[in-house]
Interface confidence: medium
């Protein structure tokens, strides 16, 4: 009963729950991760234990600084949900529930070029499509490394596609398009496409 | 049985290079953080440094440049590449495994049997 | 980095005799603290951890104590295969390192 009053005793705010925290909350198969749960209370010396489901996976200790685990997420069922408990003696508090978005990365896109020519203008429309990674996905087209479009999202397995019109160039101009999904820092690139100046019958694209 | 086994240890000249190897059976290593350290003839442990589940290396201050720890958990194997080695380095090397699951903040409750890296001319 | 001092280094004791170690960090380590044998030619064995929690299959005659700075290896009853090496280790770990302390050994000889 003495263990009871004790954890009794401790007002909430002295003791309340624990946060369980990862930097990286989308995530890939196989991707490492680091999870951090941390308690308000940097005095205490608290035993930190990370549970996924009602799977115990480790436990440590802790005074001041956040308990650090460090997990490979390979399967979907690794997702989650987490909670990580604080113990103090025979007081012990949960954190709220953490999940893991697993996304499959997107593959490298491929860039079609199509291209109506008239006299004085090229018409020139790009389609770009990741046959496979998790929608959304967002695609940008890129002329000589710099972006000519926003942003454009698209929730299915259908191509973006961006048009534009120029005056007939004299010189040659390189398109590629990016596709990304919500996985951070995780972006592919289509292989570059060259058109070439006018001039001859240089238009390889071109619908005559 | 939870098992760790050293390799790799024998007899080299100061400014050599060794790669020991611990070789770990009946438990997956992916779970672990797993330490090398050592102890000069007669004298006291010396932590060398951890690796964690993640592949997080830390290393104790004189360790730094010169040792170097690896894993291969498809192998089940943990590698310490040791190199400009000097005299003073002659010591049973260990491998150990931190007993609590996906930490570095844990203590050894298994370890291996040990291997004597000598250096000398 | 923290460093462990272990007293004494080395002791002599008889049979049934009730012998304590010392170990002292060089900082606040809370419970962070675990303590080892280890007998001449072999790996150390894990005996105590958290500084007070006895592994499982270490004879309830070794017991440890203490937190912070001060921690302390009781054997209450001496045996014959208690004669050996006693290290007392700190773990410690942060968010940018990690690292683990051994202190220098005790030494429990026959009297």
């Known amino acids: 009963r003495k263990a009871v009053l004790d954890c009794e005793a401790m007002k909430t705010n002295e003791f309340p729950s624990p946060c369980l925290d990862s930097k990286t909350k989308v995530v890939m198969k196989g991707q490492n991760v680091s999870m951090f749960c941390s308690h308000k209370n940097k005095s205490l010396q608290i035993t930190y234990s990370l549970f996924r489901r009602k799977t115990h996976l480790g436990t440590q200790d802790g005074k001041g600084e956040p308990a650090i685990f460090n997990l490979s997420i390979t399967e979907a069922h690794e997702s989650g949900p987490y909670k990580c408990k604080a113990q103090v003696t025979s007081c012990s508090k949960y954190s709220r529930d953490f999940s893991f978005t697993i996304v499959d990365p997107v593959t490298s896109p491929v860039l079609n070029i199509m291209v109506i020519q008239t006299e004085t203008d090229r018409h020139i429309t790009l389609h770009c499509l990741s046959v496979n990674g998790s929608l959304p996905i967002n695609y940008t087209f890129f002329e000589n490394h710099v972006a000519i479009s926003p942003a454009i999202s698209k929730y299915d397995r259908e191509p973006a596609e961006f048009n534009l019109t120029k005056k007939n160039p004299g010189e040659e101009e390189e398109y590629r398009c990016e596709a990304k999904n919500r996985l951070p820092n995780y972006a592919t690139y289509s292989h570059p496409v060259t058109m070439p100046s006018t001039g001859g019958d240089s238009c390889p694209f071109c619908l005559k | 049985e939870v098992q760790l086994v050293e390799s790799g240890g024998g007899l080299v000249q100061p400014g050599g290079s060794l790669r020991l190897s611990c070789a770990a059976s009946?438990?997956?290593?992916?779970?672990?953080?797993m330490s090398w350290v050592r102890q000069a003839p007669g004298k006291c442990l010396e932590w060398i440094g951890t690796?964690?589940?993640?592949?997080?290396?830390y290393y104790a201050s004189w360790a730094k440049g010169r040792f170097t720890i690896s894993r291969d958990n498809s192998k089940n194997t943990v590698y310490l590449q040791m190199n400009s080695l000097r005299a003073e380095d002659t010591a049973v090397y260990y491998c150990?495994?931190?007993?609590?699951?996906?930490?570095?903040?844990?203590?050894?409750?298994?370890w291996g049997q040990g291997t004597l890296v000598t250096v000398s001319s | 980095d923290i460093q462990m001092t272990q007293s004494p280094s080395s002791l002599s004791a008889s049979v049934g005799d009730r012998v304590t170690i010392t170990c002292q960090a060089s900082?606040?380590?809370?419970?962070?603290l675990a303590w080892y044998q280890q007998k001449p030619g072999k790996a150390p064995k894990l005996l105590i951890y958290?500084?007070?929690t006895l592994e499982s299959g270490v004879p309830s005659r070794f017991s440890g104590s203490g937190s912070g700075t001060d921690f302390t290896l009781t054997i209450s009853s001496l045996q014959p295969e208690d004669f050996a090496t006693y290290y007392c280790?700190?773990?410690?770990?942060?968010?940018?390192?990690?690292?683990?302390?051994f202190g220098q050994g005790t030494k429990v000889e026959i009297k």
């Open positions: 150990a495994r931190l007993s609590e699951l996906y930490t570095t903040n844990s203590y050894y409750s298994r």
């Open positions: 009946g438990f997956s290593l992916s779970s672990h953080a």
């Open positions: 690796i964690s589940t993640i592949d997080t290396t």
């Open positions: 900082e606040s380590i809370g419970s962070l």
């Open positions: 958290r500084a007070s």
């Open positions: 280790q700190s773990y410690h770990y942060s968010s940018s390192s990690s690292y683990a302390a």
